[in-house]
């Protein structure tokens, strides 16, 4: 058992032209976090199961806001290591995927939005207990600098964390046949329980008597490198010492295939058979397939198993992005009509409609006047999700049921007195004024300024408003 540790040193624009835009802005401040996924190197089983060695998520980094006009600098990083504990032997060869995620901290409804900024992948050979290994990986215009190591958890030691150490029974030396445990010199190696002769460097066991080989080693005692040439090689002079044909130089010598690819000669040159997740002439290009589990938030992955295969993620409602990594604020599209209130419930959208409207998007204007009668000869007028009555003369109120006081609004001008009448109102004008509302002054010479009084009606007499 042990722990794989990853230290991110920097994440920022890579060298060369085409510097990426800062992922954060004054309007949308954000912070970064990282995800690491580990798989054992050449294991077929592990290639199918995502992150079979383990995975880890970093803490969130400090909030970052872009300075307008400034180029994107290295972005502020989360504190601490990413640690991936492993329970069994350290495999020696492993694949990694490191993802850089952005958490947007704007005023998103429903919480922050996450989006994948960059993803790097690779395959490495690494002995447990060794020093930190430094690496630089590029993803598009971004560059990620990091270090990693694998360390054993006591009592395990060794390059695969398979040898066990115990405190010394005697103060001065270890028991017969047992070595001190480097670097824990005050402890001794526990008695071996593996098959006798099993290589302590390249083999390990989980049960007494067995000898299981690390990646790249074979044979009953894990002492034979997988790449050892066969004595049946068709080229080269015979070796006097071994009787084997020693291979001459060939296109596969030195193995031009990267990332654990295996080389085979062709009539003209060589061909690399790449492990899952890598492709290219020399297996130098790393690819992501559905086997890597790239779809988030319940997205379904569509694609083939070959490293060259594309993939797409079929996203559930409420998520978008090439990996379904971004939450959609579906209410920002203002789907509710007629002033309805939008509610994003995650699994569905709901519109809460104003009075007088209905339908999934409040698109139906209800017939406000249906079944509503206006009393006393009033007529119903629709509008704005509510009905109102236009009342006949002498009536008022919501349904025209109330008798109106026509004098309440003081309709008679210039001090005229108002009288309610069955057909409306009558104004008794003050001296010097005339008209239905006492609105016209009577001129001193006796001639009215405006319409002449009808015959038989003297100025000053009450005038009925008809």
């Amino acid at each position: 058992a042990g722990v794989f540790e990853l230290q991110i040193h920097s994440f920022g624009p890579g060298p060369g032209p085409g510097a990426p835009r800062s992922p954060c802005s004054a309007r949308l401040p954000c912070r970064l976090f990282f995800r690491v996924c580990l798989k054992p190197g050449l294991s077929e089983e592990a290639a199918e199961s995502p992150c079979a060695l383990g995975a880890a998520l970093s803490a969130r980094g400090p909030v970052y806001t872009e300075q307008p006009g400034a180029p994107a600098p290295d972005l502020p990083l989360p504190d601490g290591l990413l640690q991936v504990p492993f329970r069994d032997a350290w495999p020696g060869t492993f694949s990694f995927i490191i993802e850089t995620w952005r958490e947007e901290l704007g005023d998103q409804i429903g919480g922050p939005a996450w989006s994948l900024l960059a993803r790097v992948a690779g395959r490495r050979r690494l002995a447990a207990g060794g020093p930190w290994a430094r690496d630089i990986q590029r993803a598009g215009a971004w560059e990620l600098r990091f270090s990693y190591r694998a360390r054993c958890e006591p009592p395990a030691v060794g390059t695969a964390c398979t040898r066990l150490c115990r405190p010394r029974s005697a103060p001065s030396r270890c028991g017969p046949g047992l070595r001190p445990c480097a670097p824990l010199e005050d402890e001794c190696e526990a008695p071996l329980v593996c098959r006798a002769g099993c290589s302590p460097e390249h083999g390990f066991c989980e049960q007494p008597g067995e000898c299981r080989c690390l990646e790249g080693w074979t044979g009953p005692l894990c002492t034979v490198p997988v790449s050892t040439s066969s004595c049946l090689s068709p080229r080269g002079p015979s070796s006097a010492t071994t009787g084997c044909l020693v291979p001459g130089p060939g296109p596969c010598d030195g193995n031009p295939c990267a990332n654990g690819g295996s080389c085979s000669e062709t009539p003209r040159s060589f061909e690399c058979t790449c492990p899952r997740g890598f492709y290219g002439l020399r297996c130098e290009v790393s690819g992501v397939t559905c086997a890597d589990g790239p779809c988030f938030n319940g997205g379904l992955c569509v694609g083939g198993a070959d490293p060259d295969s594309a993939y797409i993620c079929h996203c559930p409602p409420g998520f978008q992005g090439s990996n379904c990594e971004k939450r959609v604020d579906r209410c920002s599209l203002q789907p509710c009509r007629n002033g309805g209130l939008c509610l994003d419930l995650g699994h569905a959208l709901r519109c809460r409609c104003r009075a007088g409207f209905a339908g999934p998007r409040c698109e139906h204007d209800l017939d406000d006047c249906a079944g509503r009668a206006c009393a006393n000869g009033g007529t119903c007028v629709e509008g704005g999700g509510a009905h109102r009555c236009s009342c006949a003369l002498g009536f008022g109120g919501r349904d025209c049921r109330e008798r109106a006081d026509p004098c309440a609004a003081r309709p008679c001008a210039h001090g005229g007195r108002c009288y309610a009448h069955f057909s409306g109102l009558v104004c008794a004008c003050a001296p010097g004024y005339m008209g239905a509302r006492c609105e016209f002054p009577v001129h001193p010479d006796g001639a009215s300024a405006l319409p002449a009084a009808p015959p038989g009606l003297r100025p000053g007499d009450p005038q009925r408003y008809l």
Epitope: L300, V302, I312, H314, C315, F319, Q320, G321, S322, C324
Partner: nanobody, 115 residues
């Protein structure tokens, strides 16, 4: 049962172009993820190009810059424009669509690239 029907396959010389069509079909709607798979003799079936239900497009590394996938939701049709064709592009090309419940496949159309 509703089927997807491909057309546009055939024989072409290296460097040539072809345009594959799939549909029209009521299956090809904007709420579905759609794509083109291909299968060469003795090989696995792999996604060449796809468009997800949220509009993200992706291509196999070997066809990037040469193939273009597009969909016409009004015509319920999916297209694959293939140019600069190579011998290794020879395969049966299958139209594909899916929603959360179902997957739909076409019968395939053969594309042969040879001098």
């Amino acid at each position: 049962e509703v089927q997807l029907v491909e057309s546009g396959g055939g024989e072409v010389q290296p460097g040539g172009s072809l345009r594959l069509s799939c549909g029209p079909s009521e299956i090809i709607t904007s709420d579905k993820s759609v794509g083109w798979f291909r299968q060469a003799p003795g090989k696995q079936r792999n996604l060449v190009a796809g468009i997800s239900n949220v509009g993200s497009t992706n291509y196999a590394q070997s066809v990037k810059g040469r193939f273009t996938i597009s969909r016409d939701n009004a015509k319920n049709t999916l297209y694959l424009q293939m140019s600069s064709l190579r011998a290794e592009d020879t395969a049966v090309y299958y139209c594909y669509a899916r929603d959360f419940e179902n997957e739909y496949w076409g019968q395939g159309t053969l594309v042969t690239v040879k001098p």
